[in-house]
């Protein structure tokens, strides 16, 4: 066996998305000879790691290796052995680790160090683990969906490869909702990006893009809920919190120490006369919506217009792909259809939140109660964020497309991240004419 096994004429790449609530491993595959063509990379596997996000391992770093084992073993099964040593592995950690780093750089470094050591024990080309910035998360999400939609291709097609794709080369905006942060990224129409921190310039396939992006740390759905609870408990008269964002009859005890564990609730922190409080659901969409709006400071804006908290936001332009938790939550609520208007979504949310908890548990017996209990809040939060936070209207709502996958690949930042790190998105249009997408469909 003295010859290197002939590699297949395909290549593979692995990206681990170390999010705040969980870690997912994605395996991508592409034809080796078409690396610079647009739209040739596709996802062949997603493996969700059992357990919480890596930031939760801060007191038990020795368990990280075992935590990653199943999905890394899955990668060994999916990718041919002859390709293992040439397959790059990247881990990007997002807002959960950004928050941990805010609390303690040393603890965040320790977690990443153990993650790196665990991943380098596998026979892949491990390229490192790092905390990506919110700006990167937004940018790579935007690259992913536009790459998959074929927006970077210079060939205008007469057919559509996905239902919501227009035939023009106008890029889609990207709306990403995680557990700890949310990102909005799009190309504004002839608008100066007034805040340099929110401006990105790309040259992709011979075309220049001036992109706006912002990541709102602490405004992912899980951290937004912690913020709302911390805000509302301030004015509670005792250790009972009657909460409109949970179904009538729902009860849950919350430790005050857990509430104030995250940097996201620091602004609401106060000394409370109790160590625990009980959430009692009352299931009222309108009141829940009002409570959520109090998390968005819209009274201050140093620019021509803002989203919230004094962050510049240009006028919305074009179509948007809303993915990650935007999609998962709306999919659960059966609200992802293009035909459902914003008014209809609001009506359905009102009905859903008002349903008694016992009835909800019976209707969705297969869903874990922890997740099930939070869909009323999450759905209401999504509406509040999109309408009041980002200024979508009933009319522009139809430009939001809730996307899970495009062409079999998950919408999210991981594909864009890998395309960038493997230099698979050239600045200039490749000399050889890329094949029509019909070749890959």
């Amino acid at each position: 066996t003295q010859n290197k096994a002939l590699p297949e004429n395909v290549k593979y790449g692995i990206v681990l998305d170390a999010g705040s609530s969980h870690t997912s491993l994605y395996i991508y595959k592409w034809p080796a000879e078409k690396e610079n063509d647009t739209g040739v990379v596709h996802q062949v596997e997603e493996c969700r790691v059992k357990g919480p996000g890596i930031s939760k391992f801060v007191q038990k770093v020795n368990e990280i290796g075992i935590y990653l084992t199943d999905c890394m073993e899955r990668a060994r099964e999916v990718i041919p052995r002859s390709q293992h040593q040439e397959t790059p592995v990247y881990l990007g950690a997002t807002a959960g680790m950004r928050l941990l780093r805010m609390e303690s750089e040393e603890l965040a470094d320790r977690v990443l160090d153990v993650v790196e050591r665990s991943l380098s024990n596998y026979p892949f080309d491990f390229q490192g683990a790092r905390i990506i910035t919110g700006q990167e998360e937004g940018a790579y999400g935007w690259i992913t969906i536009n790459y998959l939609l074929g927006k970077f291709s210079q060939k205008t097609r007469w057919f559509s490869i996905v239902p919501y794709e227009t035939n023009n080369q106008e890029t889609f905006g990207a709306l990403d909702l995680g557990g700890a942060s949310t990102q909005v990224t799009f190309v504004p129409q002839n608008q100066t990006i007034e805040s340099p921190d929110n401006a990105l310039q790309f040259r992709l396939y011979g075309k220049d893009y001036n992109v706006y992006t912002h990541s709102f740390l602490c405004y992912g759905k899980d951290q937004a809920l912690w913020q709302k609870l911390a805000k509302d408990i301030q004015v509670a008269s005792n250790e009972i919190l009657r909460d409109p964002c949970f179904h009538p009859g729902y009860k849950k005890v919350v430790n005050v120490s857990d509430l104030y564990k995250t940097p996201c609730t620091k602004r609401f922190e106060m000394t409370l006369p109790f160590q625990q409080f009980e959430i009692q659901g009352i299931g009222n969409y309108q009141q829940c919506h009002q409570s959520i709006l109090e998390l968005f400071n819209t009274s201050y804006c140093p620019y021509s217009q803002c989203a919230f908290n004094g962050i510049f936001l240009p006028p919305l332009q074009g179509d948007f792909g809303a993915f990650s938790a935007f999609y998962f939550v709306m999919k659960f609520l059966n609200l992802t259809s293009e035909k459902v208007s914003q008014e209809k979504v609001t009506e359905m949310m009102k009905k859903f939140c008002a349903q008694p908890w016992e009835e909800i548990k019976t209707s969705y017996a297969g869903v874990k109660e922890k997740y099930l209990s939070e869909y009323c809040f999450s759905g209401t939060y999504i509406l509040s964020l999109l309408l009041q936070g980002y200024h979508f209207t009933a009319d522009s709502w139809e430009h939001i497309h809730f996307i899970g996958k495009i062409q079999g690949s998950d919408a999210g930042w991981t594909l864009g991240y890998m395309l960038n790190l493997t230099n698979m998105i050239p600045a200039e249009q490749p000399l050889s004419t890329p094949l029509s997408h019909s070749t890959y469909v």
Partner: antibody, heavy 121, light 107 residues
């Protein structure tokens, strides 16, 4: 012809240091993960450690028994693998083999002839 | 660490007989198990990789089988030059480990 030739073995006192070299020829050295395996007199084989490629930032992994004392390095321009052994113990006495896998990974289809290291006072 | 246990420690056979060597792993290693032959004063030589994959230049009488935790090296008809020590090796995960060896001797 694919060949690995070890050198640098010898007699050393406990606590002393020694540096072994392995000269590779007949294959593109820089493209392959390289390993050291040792065999104590009359005993079985023991993996010492590995070094990966430049693209892997020359990542190294070691057996627990040598961690912190032994260092594997490589010089791709000289087609040479090294094993720096510090704080040597009598139990490090062994024949040290330089080895690689020219197919796939983590098995060894090419072995050197070995070099003997004796740690004794 | 994956521990490999080889049995028997010594196997006595006559030339022409079938020899069966066993290797057991402390946890499942799929088919990531390799077999080596070592003769006195020589370096080990790879015989079988990934439990059952044969190598060009190695006589067809050597075959491997097994998956998970139990593996077997079989020599269908032992030749005089086969008397040696045989080692199995975990190629699944670091640290890489070897079995203690089985000495194949003439009966």
């Amino acid at each position: 012809e694919v060949q690995l030739v070890e050198s640098g073995g010898g007699l050393v006192k406990p606590g002393g240091s020694l540096r072994l070299s392995c000269a590779a020829s007949g294959f593109t050295f820089s493209k392959y993960w390289m390993n050291w395996v040792r065999q104590a007199p009359g005993k079985g084989l023991e993996w010492v450690g590995e070094i990966r490629l430049k693209s892997n930032k020359y990542g190294t992994h070691y057996a627990e028994s040598v961690k912190g004392r032994f260092t594997i390095s490589r010089d791709d321009s000289k087609n040479t693998l090294y094993l720096q052994m510090n704080s040597l113990k009598t139990e490090d006495t062994a024949v040290y083999y330089c080895t690689t896998q020219l197919d796939l990974y983590w098995f060894f289809d090419v072995w050197g002839q070995g070099t003997t290291v004796t740690v004794s006072s | 660490e994956i521990v490999l246990t080889q049995s028997p420690a010594t196997l006595s056979v006559s030339p022409g007989e079938r020899a069966t060597l066993s290797c057991r792993a402390s946890q499942s290693i799929s088919d990531y198990l390799h077999w080596y032959q070592q003769k006195p004063g020589q370096s080990p030589r790879l015989l079988i990789y990934y439990a059952s994959q044969s190598i060009s230049g190695i006589p067809a009488r050597f075959s491997g089988s097994g998956s998970g935790t139990d593996f077997t090296l079989t020599i269908s008809s032992v030749e005089p030059e086969d008397f040696a020590v045989y080692f199995c090796q975990n190629g699944h995960s670091l640290p890489l480990t070897f079995g203690g060896g089985t000495k194949l001797e003439i009966k």
